[in-house]
């Protein structure tokens, strides 16, 4: 039974050329987190934190994505194309998969950054029908 909940930074805005921190936090479960994946709105993978090996920033983003703080992610040198949804996916044992959503709006103007921290409903899936199975590459 999946008892956990994910809190995220929710809907946030940041200035073009600036940086922003994406944060997710899993609570209310004793499940062991084996890895956390960060994914962009177009399903491109940004980063992963493996419990044993640590952080890996996917190479296409290595110059403008930084790990942390914590299990969060820092996006740098923001462009208008960075506007959109971001997802954190917690892979846990024995619970399975928890997923959180953040919406980032990148602003042209110098509007101050703001963030609303709130809880969102969890999306829980068992490993055996995890969507990541479909990410395998075949040759």
């Amino acid at each position: 039974m999946m008892t956990g909940t994910i809190e995220t930074t929710g809907n946030i805005s940041a200035k073009k050329g600036g940086s922003v921190i994406l944060q997710c936090h899993l609570s209310s479960t004793m499940a062991q987190v084996t890895q956390v994946n960060w994914e962009q709105h177009d399903h491109s993978l940004l980063a992963i934190r493996n419990a044993e090996l640590g952080w890996h920033i996917y190479p296409a983003f290595k110059d403008r994505v930084a790990p942390g703080p914590g299990l969060g992610l820092t996006l740098q040198s923001l462009t208008m194309n960075d506007t959109g949804e971001y997802f954190c996916t917690y892979h846990t044992y024995p619970d399975g998969t928890y997923r959180g959503r953040i919406f980032l709006e990148v602003l042209e103007s110098s509007v101050a950054e703001h963030s609303a921290r709130f809880q969102i409903p969890i999306e829980g899936r068992d490993y055996k029908d995890d969507d990541d199975k479909h990410h395998h590459h075949h040759h």
Partner: antibody
Framework: QVQLQESGPGLVRPSGTLSLTCAVS?????????WSWVRQPPGKGLEWIGE???????NYNPSLKSRGTISVDKSKNQFSLKLTSITAADTAVYYC???????????????????WGQGTTVTVSS | SYELTQPPSVSVSPGQTARITCSGD??????AYWYQQKSGQAPVLVIH???KRPSGIPERFSGSSSGTMATLTISGAQVEDEADYYC???????????FGGGTKLTVLG
């Protein structure tokens, strides 16, 4: 301590098939790693041959032109390389290696080949 | 096909800093890895993902990457660092993975 040990014939006839095996100890062949083959012709550099994930997914060096096949035998905790239509250019020291990954579900997020066998010499000659 | 270019040889005196370069058109969007191979031995991973050092690798080994060039730096090279060094690159989707031609590092004892 993870160890890899290559085995196979030291001499192969031209146009024949080369079959090599890599025995894995200290780790499970079913764990989330890419199991890789690399070779080194005498006096030359390293050449990546290909790899297999525990799921059965494979990647190969395009230069092999479909001559190579990598497979896993979970019951024996080993993986193998078969190379067909062998020529003298395939003479080399063949290494097997373990490549770790960050994404244990999909095999993405390459950490690097952190454990290697000691290598086995294969000579192609009639 | 994708290629990585390294200088054939680099020489330094003990205690000096050795720099070995690796160039490749796709390196801005790929990671560089560095393997050390001493004579008659299997390769050893000394740097992964441009700049990360595996446990057990001395701190004098470091890596960096800028644009199409990756660099392995050995600060205060020692005689035991004499070896062939190979850069290696891959993207996260896996294919192709490729080695550079290798650089022979001589530490003039």
């Amino acid at each position: 301590q993870v160890q890899l040990q290559e085995s196979g014939p030291g001499l192969v006839r031209p146009s024949g098939t080369l079959s090599l095996t890599c025995a894995v100890s200290g780790d499970s062949i079913s764990s989330s790693n890419w199991w890789s083959w690399v070779r080194q012709p005498p006096g030359k550099g390293l050449e990546w041959i290909g790899e297999i994930y525990h799921s059965g997914n494979t990647n190969y060096n395009p230069s092999l032109k479909s001559r190579g096949t990598i497979s896993v035998d979970k019951s024996k905790n080993q993986f193998s390389l078969k190379l067909t239509s062998i020529t003298a250019a395939d003479t080399a020291v063949y290494y097997c290696a373990r490549a770790r990954v960050y994404d244990i579900l999909t095999g993405r997020g390459y950490y690097g080949m952190d454990v290697w066998g000691q290598g086995t010499t294969v000579t192609v000659s009639s | 096909s994708y290629e990585l270019t390294q200088p054939p040889s680099v020489s330094v005196s003990p205690g000096q800093t050795a720099r070995i370069t690796c160039s490749g058109d796709a390196l801005p969007k790929k990671y560089a890895y560095w393997y050390q191979q001493k004579s008659g031995q299997a390769p050893v991973l000394v740097i992964h993902e441009d700049r990360k050092r595996p446990s057990g690798i001395p701190e004098r080994f470091s890596g960096s990457s800028s644009g199409t060039m990756a660099t392995l730096t050995i600060s205060g090279a020692q005689v035991e660092d004499e070896a062939d060094y190979y850069c290696f690159s891959t993207d996260s989707s896996g294919n192709p993975r490729v080695f550079g031609g290798g650089t022979k590092l001589t530490v003039l004892g």
